[in-house]
Amino acid sequence: FGISGRHSITVTTVASAGNIGEDGILSCTFEPDIKLSDIVIQWLKEGVLGLVHEFKEGKDELSEQDEMFRGRTAVFADQVIVGNASLRLKNVQLTDAGTYKCYIITSKGKGNANLEYKTGAFSMPEVNVDYNASSETLRCEAPRWFPQPTVVWASQVDQGANFSEVSNTSFELNSENVTMKVVSVLYNVTINNTYSCMIENDIAKATGDIKVTESEIKRRSHLQLLNSKA
């Protein structure tokens, strides 16, 4: 097809982060076209010669795909017609981090937008009471983090208190030699209090809470990606 007229279409991307070894999404939307066959999606990465992915005439066109992305990319083909050019990236690698460009061609015109993609490892922490310890102790564990995060303890009762003197954090390299298991132990715990174990690196922030009373233990954890609207 040919593009007539001088029009640029709006393309929107969202910065995001990928968890090493898992699947990730590079988000991109555009002004939709009425004919799927008139839409071309090209994903590029700065520093990479070949294409990350190309979708044209209603199907993948991978003849110019770069070797490092071979077999790892897919668009949501059924959603392209409504303006979704997001890319699914399988088995995210540390080296997938960088600047990507989502480049769109339709019968209405062309447009592109860049996005920053960070890669690392992040996981939910679980906080438990360590009954084996000589004193009341909490143990916070998270299986996969990279780069090495910081761990900070906080408590609801002693707000603003510094627990660094009564806690000990260790990082154990996992078998794939990239990610690490995070273990942090908090000593001298008092009951009828809620403690939080906060793990953070430049990609994600995760918190594990534990409420310890005489009658019950309640746990809660959540994780948020940083510098990302995803």
Partner: antibody, heavy 117, light 106 residues
Framework: EVQLVESGGGVVQPGRSLRLSCAAS????????MNWVRQAPGKGLEWVSA????????YYADSVKGRFTISRDNSKNTLYLQMNSLRAEDTAVYYC??????????WGQGTTVTVSS | SYELTQPPSVSVAPGKTARITCGGN??????VHWYQQKPGQAPVLVVY???DRPSGIPERFSGSNSGNTATLTISRVEAGDEADYYC?????????FGTGTKLTVL
């Protein structure tokens, strides 16, 4: 300041070899693909070769395939072009240029290669 | 292989508008970049992605691209704009440059 400085040009006999270098500064060299582009006297621009940021992927123009080799040393922020079996038609000013998506946004000042007997 | 055709020369009076064309099969579906090269100097990117300008390039330089023709437009031409201009696209793992146009300011 982003800068590219080529060196290694000179006069060489047909069939001989020459290695060009391009020293980069002012940017994260390993994050960018790089190119060599040449310009024969009084002629237009001709793309020669490209290399990915990691150095793991390379492309060549048909006119130099099998004779020229592009490489890089990211620890030294340097791009190279090894030119073997040189011919008279390889006589040109050789520029290194930083690849930015589908274009080239930063160019060196060029180094002159003359192939003559 | 993909080919880009430019007029060998374009002449324009100072203060007027110069238009340099770059022809290629369905070039409108490609991203076109334009370079300015003055005698004895390295090329300088003046327009990228059809119509965007790098920082430091005057607003007088603009580009468009549709169908089989991309166009570099230089408005209010100055004597310092006299140079060779090249268009460029990426096609099938190859950078393709246009044949070049010499802009003469009368």
């Amino acid at each position: 300041e982003v800068q590219l400085v080529e060196s290694g040009g000179g006069v060489v006999q047909p069939g001989r070899s020459l290695r060009l270098s391009c020293a980069a500064s002012g940017f994260t060299f390993s994050s960018y693909s790089m190119n060599w582009v040449r310009q024969a006297p009084g002629k237009g621009l001709e793309w020669v070769s490209a290399i990915s940021g990691s150095g793991g992927s390379t492309y060549y123009a048909d006119s130099v395939k099998g004779r020229f080799t592009i490489s890089r040393d990211n620890s030294k922020n340097t791009l190279y072009l090894q030119m073997n079996s040189l011919r008279a038609e390889d006589t040109a000013v050789y520029y290194c240029a930083r690849k930015r998506w589908y274009g080239m946004d930063v160019w060196g000042q060029g180094t002159t290669v003359t192939v003559s007997s | 292989s993909y080919e880009l055709t430019q007029p060998p020369s374009v002449s324009v009076a100072p203060g007027k508008t110069a238009r340099i064309t770059c022809g290629g099969n369905n070039i409108g579906s490609k991203s076109v970049h334009w370079y300015q090269q003055k005698p004895g100097q390295a090329p300088v990117l003046v327009v990228y992605d059809d119509s965007d300008r790098p920082s430091g390039i005057p607003e007088r330089f603009s580009g468009s691209n549709s169908g089989n023709t991309a166009t570099l437009t230089i408005s209010r031409v100055e004597a310092g704009d006299e140079a060779d201009y090249y268009c460029q696209v990426w096609d099938s793992r190859t950078y393709v440059f246009g044949t070049g146009t010499k802009l003469t300011v009368l």
